[in-house]
């Protein structure tokens, strides 16, 4: 249905990392514009990105209001220059997105190893607790604030000259690993939410090796 000179959006796709959430769709508009609406299951639809020629819409501000809700977005198509025009059903043409539950589906961003400190045969490795766009009491929450114990980090580490890798996990953002004195180690971290069925793991952090500037060494 719809007017003959508009086409419905298709391939509606959620792109979300650490709750920064953008809806993308096709096609690039030809003589038409789009408006996006988003709602939880309450059906209280909120309009965003009014009459845009873009094929993406940043919906972060809406989903961060409650990241555990399930959202649906819909993209309306209107003839350019005649946005009051409607389809044959008396309503503009539109298409629904897939359902999206940010808490369960947002991709975990690439972690960063903030620091490491060697004391004798122990190395304390700290992963940066990234800030998200989720707010509480006017303060931006960190990834740990949002996910709590649902979020773990895995550290992969190895002797600089070797191929054998070891792993360690933590429910905080810090690791304490055993190393050999006088031997240089390299490591990277990965964020993981074990309870998830999709998007369980982040990409790997950049590799850091002992002897680089982030490290501190004490006897």
């Amino acid at each position: 249905s719809g007017t003959t000179n508009t086409v419905a959006a298709y391939n509606l796709t959620w792109k979300s990392t650490n709750f920064k959430t953008i809806l993308e769709w096709e096609p690039k508009p030809v003589n038409q514009v789009y408006t996006v609406q988003i709602s939880t299951k309450s059906g209280d639809w909120k309009s965003k990105c009014f009459y845009t020629t873009d094929t993406e819409c940043d919906l972060t501000d809406e989903i961060v209001k409650d990241v555990k809700q399930t959202y649906l977005a819909r993209v309306f198509s209107y003839p350019a220059g005649n946005v009051e025009s409607t389809g044959s059903a008396g309503e503009p043409l539109y298409e629904n997105s897939p359902e999206f539950t940010p808490y369960l589906e947002t991709n975990l961003g690439q972690p960063t190893i903030q620091s490491f400190e060697q004391v004798g045969t122990k190395v304390n490795v700290t992963v940066e607790d990234e800030r998200t766009l989720v707010r509480r009491n006017n303060t931006f929450l960190s990834l740990r604030d949002v996910f709590g114990k649902d979020l773990i980090y895995t550290l992969y580490y190895w002797k600089d000259s070797s191929t054998g890798r070891k792993t360690n996990t933590t429910h905080t953002n810090e690791f304490l690993i055993d190393v050999e004195k006088g031997v240089s180690y390299c490591f990277f971290a990965q964020a993981v939410i074990p309870s998830r069925t999709v998007n369980r793991k982040s990409t790997d952090s950049p590799v850091e090796c002992m002897g680089q500037e982030k490290g501190e060494f004490r006897e």
Partner: antibody, heavy 118, light 107 residues
Framework: EVQLLESGGGLVQPGGSLRLSCAAS????????MSWVRQAPGKGLEWVSS????????YYTDSVKGRFTISRDNSKNTLYLQMNSLRAEDTAVYYC???????????WGQGTLVTVSS | DIQMTQSPPSLSASAGDRVTITCRAS??????LAWYQQKPEKAPKSLIY???SLQSGVPSRFSGSGSGTDFTLTISSLQPEDFATYYC?????????FGQGTKLEIK
């Protein structure tokens, strides 16, 4: 477990009024749009009205516009349908249903019978 | 208003049969279609939404397909408890409308 329990049905004369209630439990009521659907004796299903979770948006089928009013009290987890100027053709079992996004109907009550007759 | 036409109006089948019910919309509704099952003197029960998504708790022998104007509900292997009336519903635009129903009877 989602439970929806309708009440308020009964026999009413043409031109009369009735208020149906639907008590909801087992889910966060304000997080869902809700709907009323009716079924005349021996007939199929007919959508009557829907309301958003906040109560800000309401929708009606043409045949009841101006006569029926859907509302909700989220503090009481209750959905209502105020029916005025009732007609014989409003005779039906009225079902309350949960309606994610105001779209489909994923959970239904057992229904309450409204009979409009003199 | 969008008219929904179901076929056949009634259908006789045996346990174990594969059954298909069709629903046609008078205009395109994308995938905004749901299917319900209703047994005598009972409330309807949701089976399928978004044309092909199975409602939680519904057996996998039920499946839905279609987009635009033509939709099907398939029961892959009929069980005794599946004999009931089935309705489709469009939620593309208000007023939402149902098909007239398909009564599935035991042969």
């Amino acid at each position: 477990e989602v439970q929806l329990l309708e009440s308020g049905g009964g026999l009413v004369q043409p031109g009369g009024s009735l208020r149906l209630s639907c008590a909801a439990s087992g889910f966060t009521f304000s997080n869902y749009a809700m709907s009323w659907v009716r079924q005349a004796p021996g007939k199929g299903l007919e959508w009557v009205s829907s309301i958003s979770g906040s109560g800000d948006y309401t929708y009606y089928t043409d045949s009841v516009k101006g006569r029926f009013t859907i509302s909700r009290d989220n503090s009481k987890n209750t959905l209502y349908l105020q029916m005025n100027s009732l007609r014989a053709e409003d005779t039906a079992v009225y079902y309350c249903a949960r309606s994610p996004w105001g779209y489909y109907l994923d959970s239904w009550g057992q229904g309450t019978l409204v009979t409009v007759s003199s | 208003d969008i008219q929904m036409t179901q076929s056949p109006p009634s259908l006789s089948a045996s346990a174990g049969d594969r059954v298909t019910i069709t629903c046609r919309a008078s205009q395109g509704i994308s995938s905004r279609l749901a299917w319900y099952q209703q047994k005598p003197e009972k409330a309807p029960k949701s089976l399928i939404y978004a044309a092909s998504s199975l409602q939680s708790g519904v057996p996998s022998r039920f499946s839905g397909s279609g987009s635009g104007t033509d939709f099907t509900l398939t029961i892959s292997s009929l069980q005794p408890e599946d004999f009931a009336t089935y309705y489709c519903q469009q939620y593309n635009s208000y007023p939402y409308t149902f098909g007239q129903g398909t009564k599935l009877e035991i042969k």
